[in-house]
Interface confidence: low
């Protein structure tokens, strides 16, 4: 049977003064020689050699300093052996407990804690939970941590409370105000031995960001505003109104939303927020009329883009700020009413009769008075054919020259031009459009086609016809002797009711020829003017095609009327057409 004794040892100090720390003995000692052996952690397992035994006496000594945080308990396995090395007793497990000393300070899980909390949060709202651990013996004073706020920055009234045991940081009151302080730094100390003066401690920082809520109403910088703008003008920035809002800049809690509460009956104004400056930009989006409203009294309100925080929302009232707009009278100058005026040329007016033909009068009114404009000059504006003139004072419009009623400028029987009225005082100009209805040329005027073609010098004949839309056949053709002598050069002979052959009576030189032909119908009605048939005489090949390049793109035909090439606008208008060879 074992007889044993074991004392506890204390970590971190020289325990040799307590040796022997333990003693073992077997009662078999009385009748034989016994050798005592020990094994285990601290003996033959790391840390080696902490304990030694006197094999004869069974006294166990401790030889080195121990650390409870590494080995809180040593289990020593003891054996009693006879001279043959046989166990006389069942092996004994001897326990040597290491007593704790306060050699470890608390350690926070983070050296810096970051947290955030909305301003105006209720008292006792949890902000953050701090956590420190202590390596000393659990459930012992040496590891019992007490937390304490050492300092608050910015200083002043304490805003947070710290639960001494749980490490929970909570709001002390509901008076957190981001607009006063947006950040707090707490230094928190954790002390073991339940905060006793002899305890060990460590510290951490706790950085608390105060989050913005929309608890500040925007207000306008001024109590009233005024501006002036000329009538009939738009403005992308008439006034800038500055909103002041203490909430966090750049957020929807700060961003102003401007409202036109009254006075914008004509939807003349719009107001938009400049997100950079938070200013309201009052714009004029519809022209104002001094005669209609010389003064406009707007009232402007402002709220935020975000909803107001529940803690203040019921107190919000939209305070209207007056904005006085003075509309400046502008000499508005003349205007044509109506803006387009129609005139017509009487039937039968033609040729020289058109010259100085009075179409009528077109005058402007004074927009300021509504009466006919007095101090204005009239001039012709756009006039494609340069056919018109106008009396600069009366606005009477006349033709200034004869013109061809088949002109390309007359579209669907209408000639369009512009009249300008210039105010002598302001120089302001009004534009009016006139549409002149030009009656069509005699319906019975048969057109000869084609008007341009080539003929071959060796067979100088060409077939001419009136267009298929003409009626009043049979038609007769004759060469108009103008200039005198031209009729002697050309012969024209009808071949049927609508066609004739035009033949040169003399040898032609290569070049352009222009022959005036008058066509009469069966009622002896003729076109107002002779029609010019333009011919290009050239040497031809066997296919009646010109050998030179001068007639490229112009119809070439023999008297059968077969055509050989296309006509183009540019080539059809060759400008050096003469009365004889070029």
């Amino acid at each position: 049977e074992w007889i044993k004794f074991a004392a506890a040892c204390r970590e971190g100090e020289d325990n040799s003064k307590r040796n022997p720390i333990a003693k073992i003995r077997s009662d078999c000692e009385s009748n034989q020689k016994i050798t005592y052996r020990i094994s285990g952690v601290g003996i033959d397992r790391p840390p080696y050699g902490v304990f030694t035994i006197n094999p004869r006496t069974g006294e166990i000594n401790i030889t080195s300093v121990v650390d409870r945080e590494i080995t809180p308990l040593f289990l020593i396995y003891c054996r009693a052996l006879n001279s043959r090395g046989e166990d006389l007793e069942r092996p004994l497990e001897l326990r040597v407990k290491v007593m704790d000393i306060n050699d470890n300070a608390p350690v926070f899980s983070q050296s810096v804690y970051t947290a955030s909390i909305e301003e105006n949060s209720d008292a006792n709202t949890l902000v953050v939970k701090l956590c420190a651990t202590d390596a000393d013996e659990e459930n012992h004073l040496n590891s019992k941590i007490a937390y304490k706020i050492v300092s608050q920055e910015p200083s002043g009234a304490p805003m947070f409370i710290l639960n001494r045991y749980t490490g929970e940081v909570c709001t002390m009151s509901s008076f957190l105000d981001r607009e006063q302080h947006s950040m707090y730094n707490l230094v928190v100390r954790g002390s073991d031995r339940d905060g006793a003066a002899d305890g060990l401690s460590s510290e951490c920082d706790c950085r608390i960001k105060v989050l913005d809520v929309n608890d500040n109403f925007p207000t306008l910088e001024k109590t009233s505003y005024s501006a002036s703008i000329e009538e009939n003008c738009l403005s992308s920035e008439l006034i800038r109104l500055q909103a002041i809002d203490l909430d966090e800049e750049g957020t929807d809690n700060w961003l102003a939303q401007y409202l036109i509460l009254s006075g914008n009956d004509g939807n003349w104004f719009d107001i938009q927020t400049d997100p950079q400056t938070n200013e309201g930009i009052l714009k004029v989006v519809k022209m104002l009329d001094y005669e209609q409203a010389p003064n406009i009294q707007l009232s402007i309100g402002v709220k935020n883009q975000a909803d107001f925080h529940y803690s203040v929302a019921s107190q919000f009232q939209m305070h209207p700020t007056p904005v006085r707009i003075q509309v400046v009278d502008v000499r508005e100058g003349p205007a044509f009413h109506p803006s387009t005026m129609a005139f017509s040329v009487r039937e039968g007016i033609k040729g020289s009769s058109l010259l100085n033909y009075v179409l009528g009068t077109y005058t402007a009114i004074d927009l300021d008075t509504g009466n006919p404009a007095t101090d204005v000059r009239y001039i012709i504006g756009h006039d494609a054919g340069s056919w018109l003139k106008i009396d600069s004072r009366t606005g009477e419009i006349q033709f200034s020259r004869e013109f061809d009623k088949k002109s390309k400028y007359i579209i669907n029987g209408i000639y369009t031009a512009e009249i300008l009225a210039i105010d002598d005082g302001s120089g302001k100009t009004a534009t009016g459009t006139i549409c002149i209805e030009v009656p069509d040329i005699n319906d019975y005027c048969p057109n000869i086609f084609p008007e341009r073609r080539t003929i071959c010098i060796d067979s100088p004949s060409v077939l001419i016809s009136v267009n298929e839309h003409s009626y009043g056949s049979p038609f007769t053709f004759c060469v108009v002797d103008e200039p005198p002598g031209i009729a002697d050069m050309w012969d024209v002979r009808s071949t049927n009711a609508t066609s004739a052959i035009l033949t040169a009576k003399q040898v032609l030189s290569p070049g352009f020829y222009e022959i005036p032909i008058l066509v009469k119908d069966s009622y002896n009605r003729a076109c107002e003017l002779a029609q010019m048939v333009q011919l290009y005489a050239c040497d031809c090949d066997d296919n009646h095609m010109c050998l030179d390049s001068g007639a490229a793109g112009i119809y070439t035909e023999d008297i059968t009327g077969d055509t050989y090439g296309p006509v183009t606008e540019d080539q059809a208008g060759v400008s050096n057409v003469g009365l004889g060879p070029a």
């Epitope: 929807d252 939303q257 401007y258 409202l259 036109i260 509460l261 719009d270 107001i271 938009q272 927020t273 975000a306 909803d307 107001f308 529940y310 803690s311 203040v312 929302a313 019921s314 919000f316």
Partner: antibody, heavy 128, light 107 residues
């Protein structure tokens, strides 16, 4: 009585645009916001954005940014929502809804936003 | 963007039953929550705003509760006209998101 009356059903081809109108009666259009919400067949409600009819200011859901335009004509008390570059998944019923702030009797310090009056809805079909 | 999650997505009940629908926000929204009722082919109708305030004209059998992230719509005694789809919606921030809806059907 207070009501919002919307324009009739529309059929559009992919890539086209549609404009839905919403006429307010029984109150002044400029007094309250107009929200637009859509609902695809058998699906839930999807908020598209709102417009302040007084200022014309708008806020659109990110999903519709660049494709939706909300406007108004206060003289005829009408709000409009135009959706462009239509695709088949835009087939839905589009609602306009009046948005306003509510005070709460039991909690005098509270101030909340909700949509209290809705239009009858406009069906928009996008199909090639 | 705030996510709103409703449960259950559908629910069968009988006339006279007490029914509860829940709505959860992905972050705290205080009491900025509305409930709407929608019947087939009709526009939604506002029932409750500010989590618990009953909209004018809505029967008192409807009630709302909750704050922060968890909210509840309760119908104390189901009536035939209450069979519809119910949606929650947050008004805390833009975009003003809706829950997926809860379809209440007759058992």
């Amino acid at each position: 009585q207070v009501q919002l009356v919307q324009s009739g059903a529309e059929v559009r081809k992919p890539g086209a645009s549609v404009r839905v109108s919403c006429k307010a009666s029984g109150y002044t259009l400029t007094t309250y916001d107009i929200n637009w919400v859509r609902q695809a067949t058998g699906q839930g409600l999807e908020w598209m954005g709102w417009m302040n009819p007084t200022s014309g200011n708008t806020a659109y859901a990110q999903k519709f940014q660049g494709r939706v335009t909300m406007t108004r004509n206060t003289s005829i008390s009408t709000a409009y929502m135009e959706l462009s570059s239509l695709r088949s998944e835009d087939t839905a019923v589009y609602y306009c809804a009046r948005g306003l702030f509510f005070g709460v009797v039991t909690k005098p310090n509270y101030y909340y936003y909700a949509m209290d009056v809705w239009g009858q809805g406009t069906t928009v079909t996008v199909s090639s | 963007e705030l996510q709103m999650t409703q449960s259950p997505s559908s629910l069968s009940a009988s006339v006279g039953d007490r029914v509860t629908i829940t709505c959860r926000a992905s972050q705290s929204i205080s009491s900025y929550l509305n409930w709407y009722q929608q019947k087939p082919g009709k526009a939604p109708k506002l029932l409750i705003y500010a989590a618990s305030s009953l909209q004018s004209g809505v029967p008192s059998r409807f009630s709302g509760s909750g704050s922060g992230t968890d909210f509840t719509l309760t119908i104390s005694s189901l009536q035939p006209e209450d069979f519809a789809t119910y949606y929650c919606q947050q008004s805390y921030s833009t975009p003003r998101t809706f829950g997926g809806g809860t379809k209440l059907e007759i058992k």
